[in-house]
């Protein structure tokens, strides 16, 4: 029998400058694309190798963002998202939530689409 | 991990049409940007079009003969090729990365994606 999968979820503030090539990373979700079941929140999908999140360190594949600049991202279309992101300026500050995983018994699967990566 | 089978390809005359097909493992397919490229023997691979949560894009030389669409139920993404020329002839490779970037798209730099089919042979007669 598996063991139960409970997850830690904390907030963290990241500030990041906008690189050579932008932030660096990709996000899915908003209304029209729910990545997560009954969940419209925007996420992390892709951090690139080298760029800005990167070398940061601190944004991981998985976060949940919550905010851009103070600007709640609740309730926003995919590409709106998108867009908010584009035009953040050069500091940008991220509110996000970290989703960490804690193993209670034998080794789980995390599949795609689960919100922690 | 995300695997692409591309299939479709074959032998065709100049003039005529062919629809590629780009099937993906994974259940959020509907969040995936994807892309094809082409290489013929002995050049750089070549983009021919891209598919995003928002629009396509496609290379100048495919411009009014090629459609790039997807069908998200069937995790496919398709490729139809009309007034296929000779120089067409390419081995067709489907790309694809989950999410849109938040940075400006270049939906011809191949580093913009994370997995790579095997890829299917187009050739077309004169």
């Known amino acids: 029998m598996n063991g139960r999968v409970d997850y830690l979820v904390t907030e963290e503030e990241i500030n990041l400058t906008r690189g050579p090539s932008g932030l660096g990373f990709n996000i899915v979700g908003g209304t029209d694309q729910q990545y997560v079941s009954n969940d419209s929140g925007i996420y992390v999908s892709r951090i690139k190798e080298n760029g800005a999140a990167a070398l940061d360190g601190r944004l991981q594949e998985g976060d949940k963002i919550l905010s851009v600049n103070g600007q709640d991202l609740k309730n926003l279309l995919h590409q709106d998202a998108v867009d908010l992101f584009r035009n953040a300026g050069y500091a940008v500050s991220l509110r996000v939530q970290h989703r960490l995983q804690v193993q209670n018994g034998p080794i789980g699967h995390r599949g795609e689409g689960d919100p922690s990566g | 991990q995300v695997q692409l089978v591309e299939s479709g390809g074959g032998l065709v005359q100049a003039g005529g049409s062919l629809r590629l097909s780009c099937t993906a493992s994974?259940?959020?397919?509907?969040?995936?940007?994807m892309a094809w490229f082409r290489q013929a023997p002995g050049k750089e691979r070549e983009f021919v079009a891209a598919?995003?949560?928002?629009?396509?894009y496609y290379a100048d030389s495919v411009k009014g003969r090629f459609t790039i669409s997807r069908d998200n139920a069937k995790n496919t993404m398709y490729l139809q090729m009309n007034s296929l020329k000779p120089e067409d002839t390419a081995v067709y490779i489907c790309?694809?990365?989950?999410?849109?970037?938040?940075?400006?798209?270049?939906?011809?730099?191949?580093?913009?994606?994370?997995?790579w089919g095997q890829g299917t042979q187009v050739t077309v007669s004169s």
């Open positions: 598919i995003t949560w928002s629009g396509t």
């Open positions: 994974g259940r959020t397919f509907s969040t995936y940007t």
């Open positions: 790309a694809a990365v989950i999410g849109s970037t938040v940075d400006s798209y270049s939906p011809s730099d191949p580093l913009e994606y994370d997995y």
